[in-house]
């Protein structure tokens, strides 16, 4: 079943290559388990950046080696992507799945264009 997810259109990554934004989805109602997936679209290619599941009992938990961190509150997920470089500039799409209990719902945001500008190297100093 379809569900809407909302996310900002544009985000500028920090000089340290960190970008954060909120992904908000249609109310979870009695959803006890929610899966959030971050997808990166480059041309016609869609790749998974990271994914995490959270339950009504537990906080959002990405894998320890994930490039993403996040927190959840109700039907909002605050997502942070780390280690971005200029070549990481692209459209990042938030996908939310209300997994359990049934019925299953899925929602995709329109995407957040993340701009990453690599910092200029510091000039050598004598």
């Amino acid at each position: 079943k379809g569900m809407h997810a909302a996310q900002p259109a544009v985000v500028l990554a920090s000089s340290r290559g960190v970008a954060s934004f909120v992904c908000e989805y249609g109310s979870s109602g009695n959803a006890a388990e929610v899966r959030v997936t971050m997808l990166r679209q480059a041309g016609s290619q869609m790749t998974e950046v990271c994914a995490a599941t959270y339950t009504v009992e537990d906080e959002l938990a990405f894998l320890d080696d994930s490039t993403c961190t996040g927190t959840s509150s109700g039907n909002k997920v605050n997502l942070t992507i780390q280690g971005l470089r200029a070549m990481g500039t692209g459209l990042y799409i938030c996908k939310v799945e209300l997994m359990y209990p049934p019925p299953y719902y899925v929602g995709m945001g329109n995407g957040t264009q993340i701009y990453v500008i690599d910092p200029e190297p510091c000039p050598d100093s004598d």
Epitope: G29, A32, T53, T55, M99
Partner: antibody, heavy 116, light 112 residues
Framework: QIQLVQSGPELKKPGETVKISCKAS????????VSWVKQAPGKGLRWMGW????????TYVDDFKGRFAFSLETSASTAFLQINNLKNEDTAIYFC?????????WGQGTTLTVSS | DVLMTQTPLSLPVSLGDHASISCKSS???????????LEWYLQKPGQSPKLLIY???KRFSGVPDRFSGSGSGTDFTLKISRVEAEDLGVYYC?????????FGGGTKLEIK
């Protein structure tokens, strides 16, 4: 602390209607579904279905379609089970239970006796 | 509907013994997200059921570690090490993966 408190025992005649309540406290009522479970005398547990406390949408097991109705009074954090046109075989203990990823909290049960 | 079959029906034990209850489902109860919503409940006489184990092997808060759950697919087991008097009652397995969700028929743990 989290509690589900059900209404007291009922003695009814065949053909009558009963409405059992389940009042929740200690958590946000609309976050968790409420299921209803039947236990006939000396028998096991049977899941009857559940109601989504956010949308109000009920789901019934086939055997409990027709005479059975789940409803809510969200402002009072209360779920209801109504059984119409009671039959002798409805004699049982009825439990409500909160469900997230499990039935982690249960009501104490309401004993319904149907007898002419 | 998924049929949950528990064995044995009755399990006489001595206090301090180990106990093992089997629960078999008529089909795989792995849900679409890869999780298995298999639970174990204990109902003591005159009381409502209490959650022991969820998602096959996760102990609910406050449940002693002498209770453990295991299994996958269609075969599941609840083990109790060192049975205590407060463990006596009827144990039910339950699957919440496929609607209609279903309980097993129950296993009565009693003193030998």
């Amino acid at each position: 602390q989290i509690q589900l408190v059900q209404s007291g025992p009922e003695l009814k005649k065949p053909g009558e209607t009963v409405k059992i309540s389940c009042k929740a406290s200690g958590y946000t009522f609309t976050t968790y579904g409420v299921s209803w479970v039947k236990q006939a005398p000396g028998k096991g547990l049977r899941w009857m279905g559940w109601i989504n406390t956010y949308s109000g949408m009920p789901t019934y097991v086939d055997d409990f379609k027709g005479r059975f109705a789940f409803s809510l009074e969200t402002s009072a954090s209360t779920a209801f089970l109504q059984i119409n046109n009671l039959k002798n075989e409805d004699t049982a203990i009825y439990f409500c239970a909160r469900r997230g990823i499990s039935f982690d909290y249960w009501g104490q049960g309401t004993t319904l006796t149907v007898s002419s | 509907d998924v049929l949950m079959t528990q064995t044995p029906l009755s399990l006489p034990v001595s206090l301090g013994d180990h106990a093992s209850i089997s629960c078999k489902s008529s089909q795989s109860i792995v849900y679409i997200n890869g999780n298995t919503y298999l639970e174990w409940y204990l109902q003591k006489p005159g009381q409502s059921p209490k959650l022991l184990i969820y998602k096959v092997s996760k102990r609910f808060s406050g449940v002693p570690d002498r209770f453990s759950g295991s299994g996958s697919g269609t075969d599941f087991t609840l083990k109790i090490s060192r049975v205590e008097a407060e463990d006596l009652g009827v144990y039910y397995c339950f699957q919440g993966s496929h609607v209609p969700w279903t309980f097993g028929g129950g296993t009565k743990l009693e003193i030998k």
